[in-house]
């Protein structure tokens, strides 16, 4: 007995091929003997089936002796074996019909599960195999589970149903929503414009939720709330913002927020929440700003940095195209009496120099 | 062809009120942000009022927020601009225009409609 | 609310010259800037969005950059009909701010 595979929502055409090249009379019948459809002359005539507005032929084919069945808009519970009747002759074919889907959304929140289900006929003992987007392969039977899902599992899955060494296969678009990076640093001089940028890893045609922006300064012994907005259809809309530092939110998408200034007092580090409508959890994504001051009280020459920098940068203090004065891994260097000339506050990691600044010492007389 | 047209301007006393309209045709109405601007006779463009396609967020510049108030009807296709408690300078010709998609600009206006405030 | 600081306010020329026409933004605005034409009694038109995008029929010579919150709008060889006043407007977010306008006269 013949054995084909078919998709829930697709449609197949099983084949029968009578040995006389021309068109002769045919019956296609299911398990229980139920016609489902044949011919009369050149007409199509249809049985009580169940499957009687889903199933055709192609009469084109008749005269050719094929008098294939068309099953459109296939369920799962037309698996059956199919009787083609003709010329005395009986061929038969088992249709099983599978069908896989993700058990809740295909969008969901970085760090969620996927569950993708298969449904198959009873008495059937497929086995499924998917592929993520970046190449990972996961195995099981009538259910799939990927935990912690990644930015990089967005994409297209791919499963392969096997049975009666015969396979389908599935095509599914899973979205994964998140921002494209889950942490940025910020490296700015002191008085300088600041922008952070918190751009989706993702595009949805309406895009509909709420945020906040987190902030915790360095010098501050608690966080506080800068601002909360709304995302209406990718309109962004501020609702509160703290009146220090002024900050500005821009109404498109990416999200998008500056501030005047870079100050001491701003160093530190943020977290962005973003709500999605119809989503549970959030999405999130950590901002720093690192803050550059260069400074000459009297006789001392001083370089401080404010906000979270690893232990591995590197502070110095040179004179322009000079060999640097000073370079430790702190977050503050000094020169005392320092030459006339213009000096360098940099910040670097392994030689890589992260924030520049420049301070003018004037010769004393 | 998108067509915005201004009306209801005209001599007003201070402490007075107008209502400007705004009809438009060639566009489906919700889809775009919409924004009133206004210059004064002799001096530069002023943006006024904005609404969202959706018409649920209203904006408006510091100079008229309490006293003018912006809303569209989608059904009608037409742009309000509601302005209470007018004072001298307020006097200016008022234009509609309307945003691109996903707001990249102000790509079509109106030819505006004057507002006179005066005793 | 952003501050739009154009220069000049204005400024005579000749045809054929290049002009340039700069805006300051009071706060970083991505490239979320437009460059508008006014002719006398006639409603703006815009010239170009977002910086540097070129409406569609506007002429080539008509350009926009950006160096961090300094925006420029450059004409590189002036034509009759570009005798005019021009604005910016940042569309970054609300309450929109235009720039007080550069009157582009003839010399």
């Known amino acids: 007995k013949k054995v084909v595979l078919g998709k829930k929502g697709d449609t197949v055409e099983l084949t029968c091929t009578a040995s006389q090249k021309k068109s002769i009379q045919f019956h296609w019948k299911n398990s229980n003997q139920i016609k489902i459809l044949g011919n009369q002359g050149s007409f199509l005539t249809k049985g009580p089936s169940k499957l009687n507005d889903r199933a055709d032929s192609r009469r084109s084919l008749w005269d050719q002796g094929n008098f294939p069945l068309i099953i459109k808009n296939l369920k799962i519970e037309d698996s059956d074996t199919y009787i083609c009747e003709v010329e005395d002759q009986k061929e038969e074919v088992q249709l099983l019909v599978f069908g896989l889907t993700a058990n809740s959304d295909t969008h969901l929140l970085q760090g969620q599960s996927l569950t993708l289900t298969l449904e198959s006929p009873p008495g059937s003992s497929p086995s499924v195999q998917c592929r993520s987007p970046r190449g990972k392969n996961i195995q099981g039977g009538k259910t799939l589970s990927v935990s912690q899902l990644e930015l990089q599992d967005s994409g297209t899955w791919t499963c392969t149903v096997l049975q009666n060494q015969k396979k389908v296969e599935f095509k599914i678009d899973i979205v994964v929503l998140a921002f494209q990076k889950a942490s940025s640093i910020v490296y700015k001089k002191e008085g300088e414009q600041v922008e952070f940028s918190f751009p989706l890893a993702f595009t949805v045609e309406k895009l509909t939720g709420s945020g906040e922006l987190w902030w915790q300064a360095e010098r501050a012994s608690s966080s506080k709330s800068w601002i909360t907005f709304d995302l209406k259809n990718k309109e962004v809309s501020v609702k509160r913002v703290t009146q220090d530092p002024k900050l500005q939110m821009g109404k498109k998408l990416p999200l998008h927020l500056t501030l005047p200034q870079a100050l001491p007092q701003y160093a530190g580090s943020g977290n962005l929440t973003l709500a999605l409508e119809a989503k549970t959890g959030k999405l999130h994504q950590e901002v720093n700003l690192v803050v550059m001051r260069a400074t000459q009280l009297q006789k001392n020459l001083t370089c401080e940095v404010w906000g979270p920098t690893s232990p591995k940068l590197m502070l110095s203090l040179k004179l322009e195209n000079k060999e640097a004065k000073v370079s430790k891994r702190e977050k503050a260097v000094w020169v005392l009496n320092p030459e006339a000339g213009m000096w360098q506050c940099l910040l670097s990691d392994s030689g890589q120099v992260l924030l520049e600044s420049n301070i003018k010492v004037l010769p004393t007389w | 062809e998108v067509e915005l047209l201004e009306s209801g301007g005209g001599l007003v006393q201070p402490g007075g009120s107008l209502r400007l309209s705004c009809a438009a045709s060639?566009?489906?109405?919700?889809?775009?942000?919409m924004s009133w601007v206004r210059q004064a006779p002799g001096k530069g463009l002023e943006w006024v009022s904005g609404?969202?396609?959706?018409?649920?967020?209203?904006y408006y510049a510091d100079s008229v927020k309490g006293r003018f108030t912006i809303t569209s009807d989608n059904s009608k296709n037409t742009l309000y601009l509601q302005m209470n408690s007018l004072r001298a300078e307020d006097t200016a010709v008022y234009y509609c225009?309307?945003?691109?998609?996903?707001?990249?600009?102000?790509?079509?206006w109106g030819k505006g409609t004057t507002v006179t405030v005066s005793s | 609310a952003i501050q739009m600081t154009q220069s000049p306010s204005s400024l005579s020329a000749s045809v054929g010259d290049r002009v340039t026409i700069t805006c300051r933004a009071s706060?970083?605005?991505?490239?979320?800037l437009g460059w508008y034409q006014q002719k006398p009694g006639k409603a703006p038109k815009v010239l170009i969005s977002?910086?540097?995008s070129l409406q569609s029929g506007v002429p080539s010579r008509f350009s926009g950059s950006r160096s961090g919150t300094d925006f420029t709008l450059t004409i590189s060889s002036l034509q009759p009909e570009d005798f005019a006043t021009y604005y910016c407007?940042?569309?970054?977010?609300?309450?929109?701010?235009f720039g007080q306008g550069t009157k582009l006269e003839i010399k």
């Open positions: 225009a309307k945003e691109g998609y996903n707001w990249n600009y102000m790509d079509v």
């Open positions: 060639g566009l489906t109405f919700s889809t775009f942000a």
């Open positions: 609404i969202s396609g959706s018409g649920e967020n209203t």
């Open positions: 706060h970083g605005i991505r490239n979320d």
């Open positions: 977002e910086t540097s």
């Open positions: 407007l940042q569309d970054y977010t609300y309450p929109y701010t």
